[in-house]
């Protein structure tokens, strides 16, 4: 499973697309800034095994994909960029799924600490509630776009785990 190269390449492409999606100046949205508490401390203090890293990355990308697949998201972004970004995420999910199967066998599921999955889910819950509270305003989406870019960059420890041999 040659994930590290493909994943970092797709990750870079997704980040570039996400950067291009920005429509308004972040400076005009300073009043909407919010602390979403990406669980980086939990991730940084942990040496991820490959199967663990794959599961947590999958959850992050799945939640990002779901977030940007909503009707509210379609209204907020330039359609062709949004489609390219979603396609990139979808490809990443496919790569990760193929790796899960290859790493642990078709019938098995990877063992890992479920609290990391929950930490990711709760992080995206905070993002979802923020968007709803702000009624999916352009500034709220801008804040979320910047946050997702940060979270994609944060997950370095997870990416180290991808290079590890279990």
């Amino acid at each position: 499973c040659d994930l590290p190269q493909t994943h970092s390449l797709r990750n870079r492409r997704a980040l570039i697309l996400l950067a291009q999606m920005g429509r308004i100046s972040p400076f005009s949205c300073l009043k909407d800034r919010h602390e979403f508490r990406f669980p980086e401390e939990e991730f940084d203090g942990h040496q991820f095994q490959k199967t663990q890293a794959i599961s947590v990355l999958h959850e992050m990308i799945q939640q990002t994909f779901n977030l940007f697949s909503t009707e509210d998201s379609s209204a907020a972004w330039e359609q062709s960029l949004l489609e390219k970004f979603s396609t990139e995420l979808y490809q990443q999910l496919n790569d990760l799924e193929a790796c899960v199967i290859q790493e642990v066998g078709v019938e098995e599921t990877p063992l890992m600490n479920e609290d990391f999955i929950l930490a990711v889910r709760k992080y995206f819950q905070r993002i979802t509630l923020y968007l709803m509270e702000k009624k999916y305003s352009p500034c709220a989406w801008e804040v979320v776009r910047a946050e997702i870019m940060r979270s994609f960059s944060f997950s370095t420890n997870l990416k180290k785990g991808l290079r590890r041999k279990d």
Partner: antibody, heavy 119, light 108 residues
Amino acid sequence: QVQLVQSGAEVKKPGASVKVSCKASGYTFTNYWMHWVRQAPGQGLEWMGEINPSHGRTIYAQKFQGRVTMTRDTSTSTVYMELSSLRSEDTAVYYCARGGLGPAWFAYWGQGTLVTVSS
Amino acid sequence: EIVLTQSPATLSLSPGERATLSCSAGSSVDSSYLYWYQQKPGQAPRLLIYSTSNLASGIPARFSGSGSGTDFTLTISSLEPEDFAVYYCHQWSSYPFTFGQGTKLEIK
């Protein structure tokens, strides 16, 4: 619209296994974790575990670990919950419920499947 | 495991009255992950309130939720005949996810 349709009622003997199915439609099956919750007659709700239909990853409640197996078939958008070594206390209605975030968390439930364990 | 204790177990009220249902957590629950469900006989539970105080789609405004930490409340301002059912609080703040034992709201 989102729909979760479960298999029919089952009667099992103690020690046997039961496999309940939950067929999803109206959304992208692989995008959301599916949960199983049970309810004994006249009792409250009890969370059993969840499965990510995308890659089959499961998380089980400690209480059911070793007795429960959740699987999925992406070709038919169906998840399964198998419970083994059945005892009378497992007599309950078993529900599948779709995960999500915000107002989507457990917003969609199957109609329930009654499993009766009796000798 | 976070134990959720609901009180009272049964609440007998008349239509038009105000209902206050309590949910007490054994340890602190972040309000974002505390939900309320309604269940009628022979039916699956129905989402009422998400993240402590937000009304789910299609739920009438007479329902409201509040609380934080370990104490949460579901209030029905003026009971309608269709509100008589069992109500469950639920947390997904930590594994295993848990439900309260339920409060049965019955007609007096």
